[in-house]
């Protein structure tokens, strides 16, 4: 079951997967100037068996003005540039991605991919935060939301990570903890 | 389903003290912010604080600091809020919601009413 | 801290009509806003967060719209169930603020 929306934005911090549930989608999207190729896919699927999970299709993309080019090969480091916010700099590793059952990686890049990505998440997917660059986290508990079923519809539990600046931070008496860590769960919510 | 239960209405006299509790269920209720508002009568609300239970961290709004004191017991799924010494301006309802941003589940409130 | 303000205090409209209700804060809090409806003698219930995310379980009528430090919540086609009093809640500064409220009566 697809999740209906994206996981929710938090001020001053970003989100990223560590791994992918499958039946997770991610959109074959190609930056300005190029498109998929005619017979390319439209999303990349993760799939799998009860002991390997891997992405099904591959994304290619083609450049708008020619008609033939359909290279596939990893872009050079300048052309890798920033993703969207599930994309963090210093990735945080909760999990061994490879070690996840039922779970894909994050998929290599492919050669004239959009800057950002888009993945449509399944019930069950997990994400995890992290405050940005000059924020610090109030409290060291769980920093995650996962997609869950309720009354028939999905949502997303809300992430419980504070993210302060130096400012907002003096406010409050009592001393600072360490950045967040994803240990704590709080997806253990009671469906109906 | 998720649920917070509040304690029943209080009727106090200045000086007194006090100390109402919140029960969560449904969650897991050690690993959610719980996040104290208050409602004056015929007023609006006001965001006094927040609680994390599993080590009851907490956090004041300066217009509510040293004047309430929010604690929890993890084991029992609880959140307190209490004072020392009440005052007739602390007549209100006061609510527990889960947090920490926005309060997608609320208790039914708890009435205080602080009069001599 | 940030202040909200909502406008109007109260609104008077009837049973089909669209209604706004305006909130400013006084400086820009990007999308992080929330908006809540309450009836008399009951607990606040979440409508909307992120400024225009409709929360599980309400109805399509209510929308949010805005950024910066304007918003407005819009409730199209008004209902006898929607005459309660609505207020928004900044929570991009941790300290949270919320607006005085709207009352929406009827007419």
């Known amino acids: 079951e697809l999740c209906d929306d994206d996981p929710p934005e938090i001020p001053h911090a970003t989100f990223k997967a560590m791994a992918y549930k499958e039946g997770t989608m991610l959109n074959c999207e190609c930056k300005r100037g190029f498109r998929r190729i005619k017979s390319g896919s439209l999303y990349m699927l993760c799939t799998g068996n009860s002991s390997h999970s891997s992405w099904d299709n591959q994304c290619q993309c083609t450049s708008s003005a020619t008609r033939n080019t359909t290279k596939q090969v990893t872009p050079q480091p300048e052309e890798q540039k920033e993703r969207k916010t599930t994309e963090m700099q210093s990735p945080m590793q909760p999990v061994d991605q490879a070690s996840l059952p039922g779970h894909c990686r994050e998929p290599p890049p492919w050669e004239n991919e959009a800057t950002e990505r888009i993945y449509h998440f399944v019930v069950g997917q997990m994400v995890y935060y992290q405050c940005v660059q000059g924020y610090r986290a109030l409290h060291r508990g769980p920093a995650e939301s996962v997609c869950k079923m309720t009354h028939g519809k999905t949502r997303w539990t809300q992430p419980q990570l504070i993210c302060t600046g130096e400012m907002e931070t003096s406010q409050f008496p009592g001393e600072e903890k360490p950045q967040a860590s994803p240990e704590g769960r709080p997806e253990s919510e009671t469906s109906c | 389903e998720v649920q917070l239960v509040q304690s029943g209405a209080e009727v106090k006299k200045p000086g007194e003290s006090l100390k109402i509790s919140c029960k969560g269920s449904?969650?897991?209720?050690?690993?959610?912010?719980i996040v104290w508002v208050r409602q004056m009568p015929g007023k609006g609300l006001e965001w006094m604080g927040i609680?994390?239970?599993?080590?009851?961290?907490?956090r004041y709004s300066p217009s509510f600091q040293g004047q309430v004191t929010f604690s929890a017991d993890k084991s029992i799924s609880t959140a307190y809020l209490q004072w020392s010494s009440l005052k007739a301006s602390d007549t209100a309802m006061y609510y527990c919601?889960?947090?920490?941003?926005?309060?997608?589940?609320w208790g039914q409130g708890t009435l205080v009413t602080v009069s001599s | 801290d940030i202040q909200m303000t909502q406008s109007p205090s109260t609104l008077s409209a009837s049973v089909g009509d669209r209604v706004s209700i305006t909130c400013r804060a006084s400086?820009?809090?990007?999308?992080?806003l929330a908006w809540y409806q309450q009836k008399p003698g009951k607990a606040p219930k979440l409508l909307i967060f992120?400024?225009?995310n409709l929360e599980s379980g309400v109805p399509s009528r209510f929308s949010g719209s805005g950024s910066g430090t304007e918003f407005t919540l819009t409730i199209s086609n008004l209902q006898p169930d929607d005459f309660a009093t609505y207020y928004c809640?900044?929570?991009?500064?941790?300290?949270?603020?919320f607006g005085g409220g709207t009352k929406v009566e009827i007419k």
């Open positions: 919601t889960r947090g920490p941003y926005y309060s997608d589940y």
């Open positions: 400086q820009s809090i990007g999308s992080w």
């Open positions: 992120e400024a225009s």
């Open positions: 809640q900044q929570y991009n500064s941790y300290s949270l603020t």
């Open positions: 609680i994390y239970p599993d080590d009851s961290e907490t």
């Open positions: 449904g969650y897991s209720f050690a690993n959610y912010w």
